[in-house]
């Protein structure tokens, strides 16, 4: 069944790589079990960034190794992927899958475009 | 503190209908789904079915359908089971249990008795 | 419908010695996101069940680390390492992967 995934147009990641923005979905109702994954769409290629399961007793909990960390509350996500270069540059989809109880819905944000610019270098100083 | 307190329970006639509920309070209602479990005299758990309190739609154990009911009064956070053309063997203790992905609150059970 | 099956339907147990309890489901209970959804309850006389392992193997918050669940597929097993006295009661496995969610017809345990 589909569903609604709302998400900001642009963000502009910081000097250190770091984005961050909500992604918001259509009322989980007696959703427990919930799956936001972050995809990078490149062209006509799309590719998962990091992808995580929580449920309404627990918090978001991203692999250790991801290069994604979260939070939820409700109907929100907010989301922080970390390390980015500026050839990270690019549209990231939120996509949201409440996977428990059924039925099982799916939505998909339009993407947030990221803009990542990597800080000048330091000159060297005499 | 999350809550579910049951009340309803009686002896009925063969044939006769009841209405139980289950109170719920500490949490938010439509958050989370709410099932009925029946208990006859000295057997085990029987899952009747349980009730999307979002969408206010049922599901249904085979052995539950058509003669049980389920519904909601959002408003005052209660869940209810209504129960007709009752028979000896609907003798039990009814339960009301909340589920994310397992029941970690339960009512305290309310006992129906079917008797002439 | 999936059938659980327990077994066995009493055991006896003395204090400090280890009790198991089998549950066999009649088809996988794998559900379609590849979780599977099997708890244990534990029931004493004129009391509301209460939940020890969700998800097969996870201990819910307070319950003894004395207690721990293990499995896969169609089998899965409840284990106490070493049963106490406040242990007696009927304790029941339950699927919720698959509609209609369903129970096992429960395990007795007493302690001598």
């Known amino acids: 069944k589909g569903m609604h995934a709302a998400q900001p147009a642009v963000v502009l990641a910081s000097s250190r790589g770091v984005a961050s923005f909500v992604c918001e979905y259509g009322s989980s109702g007696n959703a427990a079990e919930v799956r936001v994954t972050m995809l990078r769409q490149a062209g006509s290629q799309m590719t998962e960034v990091c992808a995580a399961t929580y449920t309404v007793e627990d918090e978001l909990a991203f692999l250790d190794d991801s290069t994604c960390t979260g939070t939820s509350s409700g109907n929100k996500v907010n989301l922080t992927i970390q390390g980015l270069r500026a050839m990270g540059t690019g549209l990231y989809i939120c996509k949201v899958e409440l996977m428990y109880p059924p039925p099982y819905y799916v939505g998909m944000g339009n993407g947030t475009q990221i803009y990542v610019i990597d800080p000048e270098p330091c000159p060297d100083s005499d | 503190e999350i809550q579910l307190v049951q009340s309803g329970g009686d002896l009925v006639k063969p044939g006769g209908s009841l209405r139980l509920s289950c109170k719920a309070s500490?949490?938010?209602?439509?958050?989370?789904?709410m099932n009925w479990v029946r208990q006859a005299p000295g057997k085990g758990l029987q899952w009747m079915g349980w009730i999307n309190t979002y969408t206010g739609e049922p599901t249904y154990a085979d052995d539950f359908k058509g003669r049980f009911t389920f519904s909601l009064d959002n408003a005052k956070n209660t869940l209810y089971l209504q129960m007709n053309s009752l028979r000896a063997e609907d003798t039990a203790v009814y339960f009301c249990?909340?589920?994310?992905?397992?029941?970690?609150?339960w009512g305290q059970g309310t006992t129906l008795t079917v008797s002439s | 419908d999936i059938v659980m099956t327990q077994t066995p339907l009493s055991l006896s147990v003395s204090p400090g010695e280890p009790a198991s309890i089998s549950c066999r489901s009649s088809?996988?209970?794998?559900?379609?996101?590849?979780?599977?959804?099997l708890e244990w309850y534990q029931q004493k006389p004129g009391q509301s069940p209460k939940l020890l392992i969700y998800k097969v193997s996870n201990r819910f918050s307070g319950v003894p680390d004395r207690f721990s669940g293990s499995g896969s597929g169609t089998d899965f097993t409840l284990r106490i390492s070493r049963v106490e006295a406040d242990d007696a009661g009927v304790y029941y496995c339950?699927?919720?992967?698959?509609?209609?969610?369903?129970f096992g017809g429960g395990t007795k345990l007493e302690i001598k």
């Open positions: 249990a909340r589920r994310s992905i397992y029941y970690p609150y």
């Open positions: 500490g949490y938010t209602f439509t958050n989370y789904g």
């Open positions: 088809q996988s209970i794998v559900y379609s996101n590849g979780n599977t959804y």
């Open positions: 339950f699927q919720g992967s698959h509609v209609p969610w369903t």
